[in-house]
Amino acid sequence: LVPHLGDREKRDSVCPQGKYIHPQNNSICCTKCHKGTYLYNDCPGPGQDTDCRECESGSFTASENHLRHCLSCSKCRKEMGQVEISSCTVDRDTVCGCRKNQYRHYWSENLFQCFNCSLCLNGTVHLSCQEKQNTVCTCHAGFFLRENECVSCSNCKKSLECTKLCLPQIENVKGTEDSGTT
């Protein structure tokens, strides 16, 4: 089975790599524009230059192309805690990221928010904080993990999952209470 190609891909596949088929004359292959530029005018004929112009400030193309317009530079989302890692150039989009000791939490494929890495207070770092993943903590005895924070077993309710982890402490607390009433 031949994979379905869009019209643009079909037209491009007729020409050698780095060239595209003239939209008005399918016997002419024009040279694509370099990254950082866009197509202003198609080449007038075989072997003649394509008219490519440099992208204006605030726009870019990151690969060779025959786009009629450059792409708009992305803006980092300050309200999501994002910071600019590198600014937009004519051939590269803005790179957004998080500050030191923060990680990215993706709400969707194209939207991330920066959160502080957990410090593992009352525990130890099992896995260090990564670009896209929070620190993984292991808690000290007498503490259990809740939302990646080590919480005292004194906050463990019997109905919760923490009862398994806090079982010795819960029994000790119960024993102390019993001995206090005799």
Epitope: E79, H105, Q113, F115, N116
Partner: nanobody, 119 residues
Amino acid sequence: EVQLLESGGGLVQPGGSLRLSCAASGFTFPEYGMAWVRQAPGKGLEWVSTISHGGEHTYYADSVKGRFTISRDNSKNTLYLQMNSLRAEDTAVYYCAQHPVSHPKFDYWGQGTLVTVSS
């Protein structure tokens, strides 16, 4: 005490529309980013949309982009979700929540309103 009260859910046919509202109290509403999240039957909580505190920035899950619109009226302490072109897979309990600031977890959310999309 933070209180969030959703309304506007109901039964709607595929392709139909609904507008959800969320009345907020117990905190300074205009200072907080707000979100809509949903929980389909037998599924986990899914983030749907977020709006910044002033309303100038809006974000959507890919599954609802182009169909749902989040908005807010800070003078009325109310959050809205306009849902168009509804699909069966949009069936869920919809909750409004304060958008998280310190960790990726919704600390404060309402009791929810059920949206059922069925013919």
